[in-house]
Amino acid sequence: MMTGTIETTGNISAEKGGSIILQCHLSSTTAQVTQVNWEQQDQLLAICNADLGWHISPSFKDRVAPGPGLGLTLQSLTVNDTGEYFCIYHTYPDGTYTGRIFLEVLESSVAEHGARFQIP
């Protein structure tokens, strides 16, 4: 039986050109996390696998950084980054848990959750 729940940062907004931390947390289960996928609509951003570490999708590799924890930091935001993001936790023996985050990228200075990652 799947007892776990996914907690996410929910609906968040950030400033164009800024950065944002996408975070999900799996709680209320002792299931082992074997992999976490981060997706934007139907597009894969990143995977963190228990045995293979992180893989960042080539189309995002220059502006996505792993962390904090199993979260993801998205840099150099554009209005095209507005939309739904999903964290998909693959666990054993429970199965798959999915969390949803809605990001709105704003033209004005209303950034939240600014990250401290820097991509040289």
Epitope: E7, Q23, H25, L26, S27, T30, Q32, V33, T34, Q35, V36, C48, N49, A50, L52, G53, W54, H55, I56, K61, D62, V64, A65, P66, G67, P68, G69, L70, T73, Q75, A115, R116, F117, Q118, I119, P120
Partner: antibody
């Protein structure tokens, strides 16, 4: 097997800089974050910052911004941390540690830095 | 930043005795991680995601907790368990460690 090799010790003068290395082997260097942790008897373990060698992205503990600079060389699978303007407060053991899905699952043996004239 | 407070700072236990140490967070964290450090060695990951044993860790170790309160338990103390144990949060920057619990053998 995963290994993180660090030099044993560095003796440096006050005001100078030091660049310490952490050579990784036994895994894909560009697929894991590499963190640096300071250990002193008084302050315990402190996270300095981390780097993702896949794209060079860095994150710093605000306390160590301006003090530490993290870099990584993909060709040699080596992470580096440079500490600048050293004082006696910087005398400590510095560890590198990799992280993936399981937090900091492998640690180097640590580099002992002594700042003394 | 999230402050982790470990207690007790120092404790001793006899072989075969049950040992429990705690880690309290200043604000809620999703998971806790525990590391063991023996004198002269680097820290070693002991428990990840609050309750899962890292590779090669004896089953006498266990972790539990949620929110702001976490604990590490050794069901039957052995001489080789004498070490300092640190908790760590990995949920938000900056990552922080507890001050450590030094466990000695009686």
């Amino acid at each position: 097997q995963v290994q993180l090799q660090q030099p044993g010790a560095e003796l440096v003068k006050p005001g100078a800089s030091v660049k310490m290395s952490c050579k990784a082997s036994g895994y894909t260097f560009t697929s894991y974050n590499m963190h640096w942790v300071k250990q002193t008897p008084g302050q315990g373990l402190e996270w300095i910052g981390g780097i993702y060698p896949g794209n060079g992205a860095t994150s710093y503990n605000q306390k160590f911004k301006g003090k530490a600079t993290l870099t990584a060389d993909k060709s040699s699978s080596t992470a580096y941390m440079q500490l600048s303007s050293l004082t006696s407060e910087d005398s400590a053991v510095y560890y590198c540690a990799r992280s993936g899905l399981r937090a900091m699952d492998y640690w180097g043996q640590g580099t002992s830095v002594t700042v003394s004239s | 930043q999230i402050v982790l407070t470990q207690s007790p700072a120092i404790m001793s236990a006899s072989p075969g005795e049950k040992v429990t140490m705690t880690c309290s967070a200043s604000s809620s964290v999703s998971y806790m991680y525990w590391y063991q450090q023996k004198t002269g060695s680097s820290p070693r990951l002991l428990i990840y995601d609050t309750s899962n044993l890292a590779s090669g860790v004896p089953v006498r170790f266990s972790g539990s907790g949620s929110g702001t309160s976490y604990s590490l338990t050794i069901s039957r103390m052995e001489a080789e368990d004498a070490a300092t144990y640190y908790c760590q949060q990995w949920s938000s920057y900056p990552y922080t460690f507890g001050g450590g619990t030094k466990l000695e053998i009686k």
